[in-house]
């Protein structure tokens, strides 16, 4: 295993329909077919899998159908979008690169995004 | 190094406007959140919102919404804070701060906002 | 919001003794998100702790800082003449961020 530069954004504030996004930039040492992007979130002390995704370069990036996560790849560079983010979602979201094939093998995690979330004011009461 | 510049002291009337620019150097300016806290004279810091300089979304204090608009501009690496409707009790020092995620680790120089009519 | 309160407002004391300033939350705070700031008359607030325990850079080690929870503390184990200032304890947890109102230590 073999280590690789990964570079995020240090904050980044969620939008009021609890949608976030960010760039996840690896510095690839070679040219890797298969990439494999995983983004964890780290709060309290504990870290959760928040959704991962395999792609071939060029290729769309395919999350499972219920993932909160899609993307987008452009060489080097994995652009993520979460949604659905509530308050209590607010916390360290670590971007995690594999490159699993041709090997060698390399792996890149991020310092992390720290993604703050507000809930939307709730609509005040009308007559209609 | 990494650091902020505010623009300079203002005197205002009341129920005009005020604009202070904040320009950051040293580190990349869309990485980071921007901060805007006040402190009136003999008062302690009041944080006004932040803007994430990452994609513009804003956070700000709920007794200035609607009086207040932050905003950045990339291509100088500068933000903004725009306070309106000015009141004598808006007098105070504001300062920007970088925003991180566990502490506003670098702070502007501040400006002098005086409102008197 | 999370409300902070710093006890006590003010601190009296000699260079070389020990200061204890204490900060607490109205509600839980992750310690990752706990900082404290000193701030001297005229001059912009300056990080000193950040995740309630570390040390900003350049900030001596007679400043430390520990609790979690809702408790915090700084403590400033050997007062020198350039520590007497106004001390701030800050979440930035949950939004919107808040301050406490601060704990002026003094000369006695």
């Known amino acids: 295993c073999k280590a690789m530069h990964v570079a995020q954004p240090a904050v980044v504030l969620a939008s009021s329909r609890g949608i976030a996004s960010f760039v996840c930039e690896y510095a690839s040492p070679g040219k890797a077919t298969e990439v494999r992007v995983t983004v964890l979130r780290q709060a309290d002390s504990q870290v959760t899998e928040v959704c991962a995704a395999t792609y071939m370069m060029g290729n769309e990036l395919t999350f499972l159908d219920d993932s909160i996560c899609t993307g987008t790849s452009s060489g080097n560079q994995v652009n993520l979008t979460i949604q659905g983010l509530r308050a209590m979602d607010t916390g360290l979201y670590i971007c995690k690169v594999e490159l699993m094939y041709p090997p060698p093998y390399y792996l890149g995690i991020g310092n992390g995004t720290q993604i703050y979330v507000i809930d939307p004011e709730p609509c005040p009461d009308s007559d209609f | 190094q990494v650091q902020l510049v505010q623009s300079g002291a203002e005197v205002k009337k009341p129920g005009a406007s005020v604009k202070v620019s904040c320009k950051a150097s040293?580190?990349?300016?869309?990485?980071?959140?921007i901060g805007w806290v006040r402190q009136a004279p003999g008062q302690g810091l009041e944080l006004m919102g932040w803007?994430?300089?990452?994609?513009?979304?804003?956070n700000y204090a709920q007794k200035l919404q609607g009086r207040v608009t932050m905003t950045t501009d990339t291509s100088t690496n500068t933000a903004y804070m725009e306070l309106r409707s000015l009141r004598s009790d808006d007098t105070a020092v504001y300062y920007c701060?970088?925003?991180?995620?566990?502490?506003?680790?670098?702070w502007g120089q501040g400006t002098t906002v005086t409102v008197s009519s | 919001e999370i409300v902070m309160t710093q006890s006590p407002a003010t601190l009296s004391l000699s260079p070389g003794e020990r200061a204890t300033l204490s900060c607490r939350a109205s509600?839980?705070?992750?310690?990752?998100?706990l900082s404290w700031y000193q701030q001297k008359p005229g001059q912009a607030p300056r990080l000193l702790i950040y995740?309630?325990?570390t040390r900003a850079t350049g900030i001596p080690a007679r400043f430390s800082g520990s609790g979690s929870g809702t408790d915090f503390t700084l403590t400033i184990s050997s007062l020198q003449p350039e520590d007497f200032a106004v001390y701030y304890c800050?979440?930035?947890?949950?939004?919107?961020?808040?301050f406490g109102p601060g704990t002026k230590v003094d000369i006695k």
């Open positions: 701060a970088r925003v991180r995620g566990g502490g506003m680790d670098v």
């Open positions: 040293g580190y990349t300016f869309t990485s980071y959140g």
């Open positions: 803007i994430s300089a990452y994609n513009g979304n804003t």
């Open positions: 509600q839980s705070v992750s310690s990752s998100y």
């Open positions: 995740g309630a325990s």
């Open positions: 800050q979440q930035d947890y949950n939004l919107p961020f808040t």
